[in-house]
């Protein structure tokens, strides 16, 4: 069992205070009102790091 703030959620998941649990961000497209969706990135990470500003 994970307590809030003691360990980060794994990649692709976000903490739900409502459920006291890390939840999968993939469900947010279908169920956008979930509280953990606020912690999910709106866009996927860039596939590479830009080499110029």
């Amino acid at each position: 069992e994970q307590a809030p703030g003691t360990a980060p959620c794994s990649h692709g998941s976000s903490w739900s205070a409502d459920l006291d649990k890390c939840m999968d961000c993939a469900s947010c497209r279908a169920r956008p009102h979930s509280d953990f969706c606020l912690g999910c990135s709106a866009a996927p990470p860039a596939p590479f790091r830009l080499l110029w500003p």
Partner: antibody
Framework: QVSLKESGPGILQPSQTLSLTCSFS??????????VSWIRQPSGKGLEWLAH???????RYNPSLKSRLTISKDTSRNQVFLKITSVDTADTATYYC???????????????WGQGTSVTVSS | DIVLTQSPASLAVSLGQRATISCRAS??????????MHWYQQKPGQPPKLLIK???NLESGVPARFSGSGSGTDFILNIHPVEEEDAATYYC?????????FGGGTKLEIK
Amino acid sequence: QVSLKESGPGILQPSQTLSLTCSFSGFSLSTSGMGVSWIRQPSGKGLEWLAHIYWDDDKRYNPSLKSRLTISKDTSRNQVFLKITSVDTADTATYYCARRGPDYYGYYPMDYWGQGTSVTVSS
Amino acid sequence: DIVLTQSPASLAVSLGQRATISCRASKSVSTSSYSYMHWYQQKPGQPPKLLIKYTSNLESGVPARFSGSGSGTDFILNIHPVEEEDAATYYCQHSRELPWTFGGGTKLEIK
């Protein structure tokens, strides 16, 4: 049609272990986000949340009773179980199980409850 | 634990009038964009029935005369106009953190 039904021993003696079963239909406890809670209510009094089990077998307990509680499930049989050890007269109550799962928008309400099972602890 | 204090403990409201039930939390049950407060109705011999989830969202099938509001530590359940079938005990409950707790209940009588 979602429904839940609790069953238990009815009467037991102090120091014994209380075993409760919640049998449900109309949803699956293997569905992501789904869970079942146990809540109790002494006659004429308020509600107390006891424990919760998630679809992935993660468990949560009320800290005030955690040392005495064990929640478990049998997903294939659509059942959730609660054991309370070393019962006392203060554990006399109606015990409810309730579903907590995602609605259409992604809220997670305790939306369906069983009718409850009455438990009396008496010597 | 977050303690939820409901007031009044009981009230009598005339048919067609407004019933207002308060629930005060010992600490905030809201974030900047989410309020984790819910309301249930319980009639004698029956399990609680979910009325309102997340402060103001009416559960499916619940009449529009029920409404909820509030944020932070102060929440309200309003029933207007009150009908005979609304005679019951009402409970607030939060899901902001563990343990999930309930208020002590408010018994509504219809005059």
